[in-house]
């Protein structure tokens, strides 16, 4: 007894064709491109029905459905706007992706992505995954260079990258990306086997304020080269966030500085350091302080720091040390891990060229200097450390 | 033969998140169908959860699409469900199955939310 | 969400009666539609799919018939081993809902 004669699913067609379908007979659905087989909401890849004894196919006829890629993911601190109309998301529909004005910029692809035949939203790239919201950096409503121990009471959106780290001493450090705090090794040590500790806090000036945005450590990421006890060189750490920070006005990230970034760093050009340190009345700061400081000459810091009580070499080529001959401007306990920025007159952002690592015990001495880990030297480092976590 | 094996813990604290894997032997997850997560709470009907086909792409049940996720590898032919802020109410026997025309089922695995 | 209504929510039968399960869907499925039985403790086993056609290795005492709506799992023979609960599904549209089940006994 024949089976009756397949009808094809619109868009789809059968193979083979025969005249009659009599018993172990069988026929395939295939579906145009754009279209796929489809048994209700069960996908499936291919399809073939074999005729039964009694007359009968051994299962339905599918339809060939025009693949629906679905609704876009929603993109962190971005939208997306349906192009070809309100909804569409079926074959060969259009979406674009992009992301939130002046605090992020995007980055993979141009945010353009096309419904494909396989069913995944895809960039002009080729790329099935999302782009990625970036946060800028170095954005601050300071607009100079140039010109905390003898320091300035900052303003809002001066230094936005600006962290409190709690959670042992008070100390600082300088936001990177969205979820990266970068610090001195010295500042966290203590905590580097109990990241959950940190008590990190961000886009506020007072440091006794209760409005502050509260974000928590995941992970501490200390320096292998950074010996506790023994001096400061490779005083550099990362701090992993547990969760990615609301990129605002007042919470920014700091640039690393770019292989041209030293331009801006020689003797006598001016950085600035900010924190919540011990100032001049020997009292850490209520508001965020903030210094303008040029650097010093990296012989003549050395030398400052030969004689007793300072152990020969103390000074390293991976610092960089910043203040005045007459003293009276200085970074101090407290500022500990915070950053020195500097203004690339290129890009017009802000960069963190130094970290707030040691300096004389007497803040803002004559003659003496503070002392900064030269992050520049720490750029394969801090890249490996962000890409492998 | 076509076999299923769910793997996972059996407790999971409130608030957590929940993961269990499904192991598929005697049948290539992208050779075709759709490979599902179902759950039995304690005395309750079944509540299908999601599936991922055999091209990779996902489908989830709306009641759970802000904390479901449906993964594979296809190296070891398996597929994998994690579900966020788990609550008591999570608490059931989960199953993945392939579903329609080639329909198994794995021997299910209970979990537990609780503190 | 397509609600799957089954009726009875129990039912007791003798062995050989021949025993009905309905299964009414909210809206139109089409013949997207399979049942399960499923006993204590144990795993959901398919028995139809697309509203009538037999898993291989399903008795011929079990058939399914409907399209649309309205569903019917029939045993023309109640056997001892058909003690289970059973569930219609509809996979016709997202998400897949099961009926809330049939509880079969044996009088």
């Known amino acids: 007894q024949p089976c009756p004669y397949p009808m094809a699913p619109p868009n789809g067609h059968v193979s083979p064709v025969q005249a009659k379908y009599i018993l172990k007979d069988s026929f395939s659905i295939f579906c145009e491109t754009g279209y796929e087989l489809l048994q209700g909401h069960l996908p499936l890849k291919s399809f073939t029905a074999v005729c039964q004894k009694d007359g009968s196919w051994d299962r339905p006829m599918p339809a060939c459905s025009i693949v629906d890629c679905g609704p876009p993911d929603d993109l962190p601190s971005g939208r997306v706007e349906y192009i070809t109309g309100p909804g569409v998301t079926t074959y060969k529909a259009v979406i674009q992706y992009s992301c939130e004005e002046t605090f992020y910029t995007m980055k993979v692809n141009d945010g353009k992505y096309v419904c494909e035949a396989d069913g995944f939203w895809t960039s002009s790239k080729g790329e099935k995954s999302l782009p990625v919201c970036e946060p800028v950096c170095g954005l601050s409503a300071r607009t100079t260079g140039g010109r905390i121990y003898g320091g300035q009471k900052a303003k809002p959106g001066d230094f936005p990258w600006q962290v409190l780290i709690l959670g042992g001493t008070t100390a600082a450090g300088a936001l990177l990306y969205d979820n990266w705090v970068l610090t001195a090794a010295h500042a966290v040590y203590e905590q580097k086997h109990d990241a959950s500790a940190l008590d990190i806090r961000m886009g506020t000036l007072k440091r006794l304020s209760p409005h502050y945005t509260q974000a928590w450590s995941e992970a501490v990421f200390i320096h292998e080269g950074y010996t506790h006890d023994a001096g400061f060189d490779n005083d550099i750490a990362l701090i992993k966030l547990n969760n990615k920070v609301v990129i605002n006005s007042n919470i920014t990230p700091i640039c690393l500085p770019r292989k041209e970034a030293e331009s801006f760093m020689r003797t006598d050009d001016i950085g600035t350091a900010s924190g919540w340190g011990l100032t001049q009345r020997g009292f850490l700061a209520r508001n965020l302080m903030y210094v303008d400081i040029p650097i010093v000459d990296h012989q003549k810091c050395t030398a400052a720091y030969e004689k007793p009580p300072y152990p020969r070499g103390s000074v390293t080529a991976n610092m960089l040390c910043a203040g005045l001959e007459s003293g009276g401007k200085d970074s101090c306990r407290g500022d500990s891990g915070g950053a020195l920025v500097f203004l690339d007159s290129e890009t017009e952002r802000w960069f963190v060229g130094g970290i707030v690592s040691w300096g004389s015990m007497n803040c803002g001495e004559a003659g003496q200097y503070g002392v900064y880990t030269k992050v520049i030297n720490y750029i394969p480092w801090i890249e490996n450390i962000i890409s492998d976590f | 033969e076509v076999q299923l094996q769910e793997s996972g813990p059996g407790l999971v604290k409130p608030s957590q998140t929940l993961s269990l894997t499904c192991t598929v032997s005697g049948y290539s997850i992208t050779s075709d169908y759709a490979w599902n997560w179902i759950r039995q709470p304690p005395g309750n009907k079944l509540e299908w959860m999601g599936y991922?086909?055999?091209?990779?792409?996902?489908s989830y049940n709306p009641s759970l699409k802000s904390r479901i996720t449906i993964s594979r590898d296809t190296s070891k032919n398996q597929f994998s469900l994690k579900l966020s802020s788990v609550t008591a109410a999570d608490t059931a026997v989960y199953y993945c199955a392939v579903l329609y025309a080639l329909d198994y089922w794995g021997q299910g695995t209970t979990v537990t939310v609780s503190s | 969400d397509i609600q799957m209504t089954q009726s009875p929510s129990s039912l007791s039968a003798s062995v050989g009666d021949r025993v009905t399960i309905t299964c009414k869907a909210s809206q139109n499925v089409d013949t997207n539609v399979a049942w399960y039985q499923q006993k204590p403790g144990k795993v959901p086993k398919a028995l139809i799919y697309s509203a009538s056609y037999r898993y291989s290795g399903v008795p011929s005492r079990f058939s399914g018939s409907g399209s649309g709506t309205d569903f019917t799992l029939t045993i023309s023979s109640l056997q001892p081993e058909d003690v289970a609960t059973y569930y219609c599904?509809?996979?016709?549209?997202?998400?897949?809902?099961f009926g809330q089940g049939t509880k079969l006994e044996i009088k």
């Open positions: 599904q509809q996979y016709n549209s997202n998400p897949l809902t």
């Open positions: 991922i086909s055999y091209s990779g792409r996902t």
